[in-house]
């Protein structure tokens, strides 16, 4: 921002009223008046170029310093060319000297040269030659000097003429301030510019109404340079929650809009499924039946729990069931749907029911499922099972009602035994099997059926209560098809896969384990 100038003295604006001291009186500098555009123009002039040893002084009135530390002195003046005078006037000069003196009181007409300190010799950029002077085309020069730091109550300026032809039209003395400033939603007060060129005065800003320093952010600061310019902004303020930046101020969010945190972003329109917000809202309340999960941003629409899974099937395969379902028709407006499967088993005879999570096995953990199918195994035969699939999303925990669908299935068979070959010889095969422990109590006997591969006309059956059997009197180097089936009081259970096992050839010896 441009520096602000505070004027302490303005000769041109004073209209000849200042009454500066001249020394010697009347013989050197003197006040003159000219009329330009019907306005009086005043100037102090001296032109004693034909006389040697000039020492003419013009002293300003006493100027109260106030809060100024460094003053700037702007001079507007004309200087006539020494060649305008006969023989170039050997004593003629084309410069004058600028002085100042500080004091705590006004000395009035008591003028003492020795109190004055020279600031500089003032030389014109352009001199006014004779022809220009006579044609009224004077060359106006502008020079600026500065002095500081000043410490006394006031000061004088003085102009020493040593034989020039000078007209001083304007003397303006001012100091600079960094103007009051609004930047980054921070207010910086008007600040006096420092006196030393390299130094920058650090000025703390204050956040405007309804603005705050963001968490972890730097407090707003600016630097006021010697020329009254603000430099090097540090930190900023942001409009607080419920307010947005409008030009250099923070304005409350309009009804129907909200802003949930201090940020640079504007107020946002209330999302779907919210109630109209009042002015200055930091969030928008959800409509009845809609909710916001703790981790949901305020900008997200309010949502509700999903409806139940749309379609659920339970397909039994022996002692296994494959559950399949389709997503809810109403997702509640969310994408974070998960499913939970629970299981209940009932004994047909007694009608007694209970949870069966401990006795069954799921193909993947039954809670927090993202897929829409799961396989349940280790089911007991001749038992009724009811499976419940519940759909949940991020706001389901905020309501007491649940969204689920159930499917029931009756298990009539045991699970097929898992068969393995334990050993073989040229004439025998040793076979074992297993079924899930919960089902073992229901099994009365196991039936092992075997036959030569390729012979579909005859087969042999062996029954046993145990979990293994050795099949003897077999032909060497022959492949047999073997199947094991559990027998229960209610009938046959599911049969195992048909396995192909081969006896050893005569060259092979002994009973070798496989």
């Amino acid at each position: 921002a441009q520096g602000k100038e505070v004027v302490l003295l303005d000769f041109a604006a004073a209209g000849g009223e200042l009454g500066w001291l001249t020394h010697p009186y009347g013989k050197g500098w003197d006040l003159m008046q000219n009329i330009m555009n019907d306005m009086p123009i005043y100037m102090y002039s001296v032109c004693n170029v034909m006389s040697g040893d000039q020492d003419n002084w013009l002293r300003t009135n006493w100027v109260y310093r106030g809060e100024a530390e460094r003053i700037f002195i702007e001079l507007k003046f004309t200087v006539r060319d020494c060649n305008s005078f006969p023989g170039g006037a050997s004593s003629c000069k084309e410069t004058f000297n600028l002085y100042y003196a500080e004091s705590d009181l006004d000395y009035g007409t008591n003028f003492q040269k020795r109190l004055f300190t020279k600031i500089d010799t003032i030389a014109p950029d352009e001199i006014t030659v004779s022809s220009d002077f006579e044609a009224r085309h004077v060359k106006l020069n502008v020079e600026e000097r500065s002095v500081g730091p000043l410490t006394r109550k006031g000061f004088y300026l003085a102009f020493q003429d040593i034989g020039a032809c000078v007209a001083l039209l304007s003397v303006r003395v001012y100091y600079k301030k960094c103007p009051e400033l609004l930047q980054g939603l921070a207010h910086f007060p008007e600040t006096i510019a420092g006196s030393d060129a390299p130094s920058l005065a650090t000025v703390a800003g204050t956040c405007v109404d309804h603005a705050v320093v963001p968490p972890g952010g730097e407090e707003p600061r600016m630097h006021c340079a010697v020329d009254g310019e603000w430099l090097v902004p540090i930190g900023q303020c942001l409009c607080q929650a419920g307010y947005e930046k409008v030009e250099d101020a923070c304005q409350a969010c309009s009804p129907g809009f909200f802003k949930f945190e201090a940020s640079e972003s504007p107020c946002l329109e209330c999302p779907e499924h919210t109630l109209p917000s009042p002015e200055g809202a930091t969030s928008c309340e959800c409509e009845e039946g809609f909710f916001r999960a703790p981790q949901d941003p305020a900008s997200m629409p309010c949502t509700r729990p999903p409806s139940a899974p749309h379609y659920l099937t339970a397909v039994g395969m022996g002692a296994k069931v494959e559950l399949r379902w389709t997503p809810p028709q109403d997702s509640g407006g969310r994408e974070d749907i998960v499913y939970s499967v629970t299981c209940e088993q009932c004994w047909p005879e007694s009608g007694e029911c209970g949870p069966c999570e401990a006795s069954v096995r799921y193909s993947e953990p039954p809670h927090g499922l993202t897929r829409t199918s799961v396989t349940v195994s280790d089911l007991e035969p001749h038992m009724n099972y009811t499976f419940t699939v519940e759909a949940r999303n991020g706001v389901s925990g905020l309501v007491t009602s649940r969204s689920f669908r159930t499917a029931s299935v009756s298990i009539n068979q045991t699970e097929p035994p898992k068969v393995r070959l334990e050993g073989r010889s040229t004439t025998s095969l040793s076979v074992s099997w297993s079924i899930p422990p919960p089902q073992q109590s229901r099994v009365w006997k196991y039936e092992v059926t075997y036959r030569k591969k390729g012979d579909s006309n005859s087969y042999n059956v062996r029954r046993t209560e145990g979990f293994s059997v050795t099949l003897d009197d077999l032909a060497p180097d022959t492949t047999y098809l073997v199947q094991v089936q559990a027998l229960t009081q209610e009938g046959q259970g599911a049969g195992s896969k048909v396995h192909e096992f081969q006896t050893l050839s005569p060259e092979g010896s002994g009973n070798l384990a496989v």
Epitope: Q33, S45, M50
Partner: antibody, heavy 120, light 108 residues
């Protein structure tokens, strides 16, 4: 209105003294340098003396230096010229005049003039 | 330092007349011009570059060049018959201010 009214002239013998007065009205007397200008009978104007607005600075023409004293009383808005050791060549109409700006004029307001005759 | 004027100048009514003023001081400082009619105090006509106090007719004008200053009356009138004096600051330092000897203008 702005005016200067003079008094105190008359006939005086050579070597005698006379005091002229000039009463100002219609302007801020204390802000202006004041002059005395004289005009001998049938002759031109001759500058005599000046006094600065506060009265601290005074200058005289060589012809009157040491004999004439200019003074002012700003509280009474009056300018004075004390003339001592008067000579025949001091015979003239004496005018008080206001310097409109600065010390040296121009002279924008003049008194009506007062005749001083030095004769035995 | 002296300012030199012609002792007398005459002009026919309605004509233009110029009164001159010569002097070294005029290189440095502008002349002022005064009109004096018999039995009255002088009256300021022109000062500075060419400035007229209020009430002075615009037929009076001033100019300067080098060591010379001029007062011009364009369209002289009978009432302009008077003595005219130039005046300037003294650049020599000998005097504070100097007057010319005066010019008697006769309007024929």
């Amino acid at each position: 209105q702005v005016q200067l009214v003079q008094s105190g002239g008359g006939l005086v013998q050579p070597g005698g003294s006379l005091r002229l007065s000039c009463a100002a009205s219609g302007f801020t007397f204390s802000s202006y340098a004041m002059h005395w200008v004289r005009q001998a009978p049938g002759k031109g104007l001759e500058w005599v003396t000046v006094i600065s607005p506060p009265g601290s600075n005074k200058y005289y023409a060589d012809s009157v230096k040491g004999r004439f004293t200019i003074s002012r009383d700003n509280s009474k808005n009056t300018l004075y010229l004390q003339m001592n050791s008067l000579r025949a060549e001091d015979t003239a109409v004496y005018y008080c005049a206001r310097a409109s700006v600065g010390a040296t004029g121009p002279f924008d307001i003049w008194g009506q003039g007062t005749l001083v005759t030095v004769s035995s | 330092s002296e300012l030199t004027q012609p002792p007398s100048v005459s002009v026919a009514p309605g004509q233009t007349v110029t009164i001159t003023c010569q002097g070294d001081s005029l290189r440095s400082y502008y002349a002022s011009w005064y009109q004096q009619k018999p039995g009255t105090a002088p009256k300021l006509l022109i000062y500075g570059e060419n400035n007229r106090p209020s009430g002075v007719p615009d037929r009076f004008s001033g100019s300067s060049s080098g060591t010379s200053a001029s007062l011009t009356i364009t369209g002289a009138q009978a009432e302009d018959e008077a003595d005219y004096y130039c005046n300037s600051r003294d650049s020599s330092g000998t005097h504070l201010t100097v007057f010319g000897g005066g010019t008697k203008l006769t309007v024929l």
